[in-house]
Amino acid sequence: ACDTATCVTHRLAGLLSRSGGVVKNNFVPTNVGSKAF
């Protein structure tokens, strides 16, 4: 999987969208690693 900063951000956006945004406040691009996906 792509692990660049931009890929991580887009992937997290998709995850947040699918979860309805119901995730921890610290679940942000700069504070998650690729393993979080």
Epitope: C2, T4, A5, P29
Partner: antibody
Framework: EVQLVQSGAEVKKPGASVKVSCKAS????????MNWVRQAPGQRLEWMGV????????TYNRKFKGRVTITVDKSASTAYMELSSLRSEDTAVYYC????????????WGQGTTVTVSS | DIQMTQSPSSLSASVGDRVTITCKAS??????VAWYQQKPGKSPKALIY???YRYSGVPSRFSGSGSGTDFTLTISSLQPEDVATYHC?????????FGQGTKLEIK
């Protein structure tokens, strides 16, 4: 309203260094990566590097061979790009850019900073 | 580094025309491609991410497609305000790289 406001135009001599700032507002600065991109006259956009403002980790374009340094001041929500050993080919418009998810899912760019390198 | 080759370099079309700009990557970048619109003297504006997704606020006449090495930006019905230079970018690998730009003019 999300804004990335960059410092003003600079004129530098060959061999000198330049430091461009990018002040972020309207979002949580440390939550999102900050990129720096430049555009020389008549040339394609060129990515210089990215910083994770949360912990300061950087990734640079190897083309710049250690001449570029990206830093942040978290307390001021400001990113900096310093380019050293300037040459005429570094004459360009320099942009900061950040891809956000909140408050809006969008790729925001600063207004650009013109750096002219001339003897 | 990944080379992104855009074509054409420039094009002239009439209002209402369907316009297609292509971008070819030198190796597989999946769908990790973005498209930007840049008007003279302005910063690039994001249009498309992940090859085919429009950012909120981008008119529906803009669409993107492709995967692997071949990507397309289409404007379904050209408007006068679409006069600009369009750039593709791959972000699958560092360093991110851009196409050389396509300058779009109105006939």
């Amino acid at each position: 309203e999300v804004q990335l406001v960059q410092s003003g135009a600079e004129v530098k001599k060959p061999g000198a260094s330049v430091k461009v700032s990018c002040k972020a507002s309207g979002y949580t600065f440390t939550d999102y990566y900050m990129n720096w991109v430049r555009q020389a006259p008549g040339q394609r956009l060129e990515w210089m590097g990215v910083i994770n403002p949360y912990q300061g980790r950087t990734t640079y374009n190897r083309k710049f061979k250690g001449r570029v340094t990206i830093t942040v001041d978290k307390s001021a929500s400001t990113a900096y790009m310093e380019l050293s050993s300037l040459r005429s080919e570094d004459t360009a418009v320099y942009y900061c850019a950040s891809l956000l998810i909140r408050p809006h899912y969008f790729d925001y760019w600063g207004q650009g900073t013109t750096v002219t390198v001339s003897s | 580094d990944i080379q992104m080759t855009q074509s054409p370099s420039s094009l002239s079309a009439s209002v209402g025309d369907r316009v297609t700009i292509t971008c070819k990557a030198s190796q597989n970048v999946g769908t990790n491609v973005a498209w930007y619109q840049q008007k003279p003297g302005k910063s690039p504006k994001a249009l498309i991410y992940s090859a085919s997704y429009r950012y909120s606020g981008v008119p529906s006449r803009f669409s993107g497609s492709g995967s692997g090495t071949d990507f397309t930006l289409t404007i379904s019905s050209l408007q006068p305000e679409d006069v600009a230079t369009y750039h593709c970018q791959q972000y699958n690998f560092y360093p991110y790289t851009f196409g050389q730009g396509t300058k779009l003019e109105i006939k």
